[in-house]
Each structure stands twice: as C-alpha cells, then as structure tokens.
Amino acid sequence: HNTTVFQGVAGQSLQVSCPYDSMKHWGRRKAWCRQLGEKGPCQRVVSTHNLWLLSFLRRWNGSTAITDDTLGGTLTITLRNLQPHDAGLYQCQSLHGSEADTLRKVLVEVLADPLDHRDAGDLWFPGESESFEDAHVEHSISRSLLEGEIPFPPTS
C-alpha cells in the first residue's frame, strides 16, 4: 500500500477519508489503528459500531471519531483538537474474523497553528454551549508519499 499524507493544523479538526470497494468489504466492520514503529503492531484506536448495519453512527474514542458509509465505500476518521502527538502513521482497516485488511496507510502531519502567536483578544473561541465541530470546519490536505520517502525516521 502507498501511504497517503493528511495534514492538519494544531488545535483544529482533521478529517481522514479511506475509500474502499463497498462490495468487497460488505458486512465487514472497520477500524482505525496507529502504527507502533516501522514494523511494529497497529494499535486499535477506534472501530465502527459492533453492528455493521449501524456503521454510519459516529463512534468516539477520546478525540478520535469513526464513521462508515458502507454503501458509498468511504470510511471517515475525525481527529478533533489535533495535537503534535497525534502525528504519525495510521491505518484504515477492514475487519473479518480476527483479521484486518489494510484499506489505506495514512501519515498524519500536524502543522503549527499560524494564529497561535497572536494576541488572544484577536482569537474567537466557541462558547460552552457551542459544538466544537460547528466551530471549526473539518479539513485536510492530503498527498501520497513520494517514492523513497519514509514515514518513520531511519533507526540506527
């Protein structure tokens, strides 16, 4: 699998999309996992609803959400309030039995907030009653890794 890079701004939301063949993966739950090292295991962060028919319902684990358009064949992961420690290599997975097929490898890059040096008086913060997701348009910049580019720093 090629690795697709998604870039988001610290403090904002990042939306990652993973397209797949909806018939090939019919009936299969999906998951989002974080790769631990270049050859390490992929640690499950969040998975879709236990009932596949309810996969469209958004499920959260901490600041990460997952939802699956099983008809259109798009898995969507939202990383809310993106932080520098969220940067790293992830996978979108299709689950069958205890196994997982990789749908897409994703490198999340976190960019510094261009506003974070301004006077706080110039910033707008959502009120307590307002939804964070309403306050920030979810967005991402994505690209595929160039050949030879490596998502992990080389180990000595």
């Epitope: 009936g27 596949w52 039995g97 205890s98």
Partner: antibody, heavy 123, light 107 residues
Framework: EVQLVQSGAEVKKPGESLKISCKGS????????IAWVRQMPGKGLEWMGI????????RYSPSFQGQVTISADKSISTAYLQWSSLKASDTAMYFC????????????????WGQGTLVTVSS | DIQMTQSPSSVSASVGDRVTITCRAS??????LAWYQQKPGKAPKLLIY???SLTNGVPSRFSGSGSGTDFTLTISSLQPEDFATYFC?????????FGQGTKLEIK
C-alpha cells in the same frame, strides 16, 4: 438461483499441467469471494485459498502457496485453479465455494458450493 | 494455523436419537465457527454459521452453541436424511481450517 458449476473430471500424468474452472451464476460474481477446497480420497476438507474476482485479490493457505495458482476472469464469471506440474499426491476432489459475509458477524462462510471436480494423477 | 479437533470421529445412532458432536479450536475463535454436512459424492452444505445461526432451510432440529474454543453441534431427533459426515470450520483467520470430520452412521 445461485449456482457454481465446475468443469469435468480430469485424468492426468505426473508432470502435466492442468486448469480447472468454476462458473458462477445467479448472483454478482465480481462481488463475492470464491474459495477452493481440496478433499483427498476418504479424507477431510482443506482450504487452499480464496480470490475476489472484482480485483483478483488472492490469499493462499501456506500449504498450497507456490503449488497452485488461483485466478478469475470476471468477464465470464469464472474462477480457476491451476497446476503447472501435477503430482500423484494432487489426486483429490476439488470444490469451489462462494464465501458470504454475514453482516452481523463480520466473517465469511461458504454458503454455496460447486459439485466438485475429481482430479486423478497417475502414471 | 488454528487446529480444529472434532470428537467423536464416528458415532452410531438410531432415528429419533439426540446426537452431540463437539469441536475444539487450538486457540480462541470467538463465535467465528461454521458447521457443514456432507453426504457421499456430494459437496458440503452449510448448516450453521457464527456458531449458532441456522442457515435458511435447515431444519430446527439442528442447533449450534459455544464460543472461544469449545463448540457443539446438536441434532435433537435424528432423521434418516441426517446420516452423513459433519465438519466444523473456523472463520477467525487465514488459512481457514476444518475439523477432521465426524461420521454419523445408522446403528
């Protein structure tokens, strides 16, 4: 009606090549996985591998990897199992089976089977 | 690979009897297990999937139970057409593996 129709019995000599087929009908062939299962005379069932005809994604059992090739031609709704050099130990009944995922289980089971192709390898 | 072990390897019973076949997996497979029936010269037929779900058209005298490593197939009242060989199969991981089979014979 879902049907998997396999090619007829084959008698071959050791070292010869062979390709047997499994034609699906009554459902969307490109959208379902097809598995191949071996049954040696008087023995149990052995899963050889599986293919998704839509994009030819194939998985093999380690026991059969490199021994056989699984392929599919989605334009004629047919899956194949082939050998480049048969051995006497390949003598068996070979079944193809459709693999169906049950949505509340997220795994797959073989719900429709072909009638089987008997392959006899003898000098 | 996950090993599937069935017991007994053969069983003799009479019409009307209750018969139980067991299947043990070498490691936990949750409820990802199927049972198939095979008659001589025929292809296997899916009876039960997900350990306990009956396939459409399969008589209710067949039932499956278990999870993890231990599973059972029960035929509550044997009918003449039930004499056949039964196989369990794990659907947990690749390669898919089958039990060695249990031959159900007429006493």
């Amino acid at each position: 009606e879902v049907q998997l129709v396999q090619s007829g019995a084959e008698v071959k000599k050791p070292g010869e090549s062979l390709k047997i087929s499994c034609k699906g009908s009554g459902y969307s062939f490109t959208s379902s996985w097809i598995a191949w299962v071996r049954q040696m005379p008087g023995k149990g069932l052995e899963w050889m591998g599986i293919i998704y005809p839509g994009d030819s994604d194939t998985r093999y059992s380690p026991s059969f990897q490199g021994q056989v090739t699984i392929s599919a031609d989605k334009s004629i709704s047919t899956a194949y199992l082939q050998w480049s050099s048969l051995k006497a130990s390949d003598t068996a009944m070979y079944f193809c089976a459709r693999s169906r995922t049950f949505y509340y289980d997220s795994s797959d089971y073989f719900d429709y089977w072909g009638q089987g192709t008997l392959v006899t390898v003898s000098s | 690979d996950i090993q599937m072990t069935q017991s007994p390897s053969s069983v003799s019973a009479s019409v009307g009897d209750r018969v139980t076949i067991t299947c043990r997996a070498s490691q936990g497979i949750s409820s990802w297990l199927a049972w198939y029936q095979q008659k001589p010269g025929k292809a296997p037929k899916l009876l039960i999937y997900a350990a306990s779900s009956l396939t459409n058209g399969v008589p209710s005298r067949f039932s499956g139970s278990g999870s993890g490593t231990d599973f059972t197939l029960t035929i509550s009242s044997l009918q003449p057409e039930d004499f056949a060989t039964y196989f369990c199969q794990q659907a947990d991981s690749y390669p898919r593996t089958f039990g060695q089979g249990t031959k159900l014979e007429i006493k």
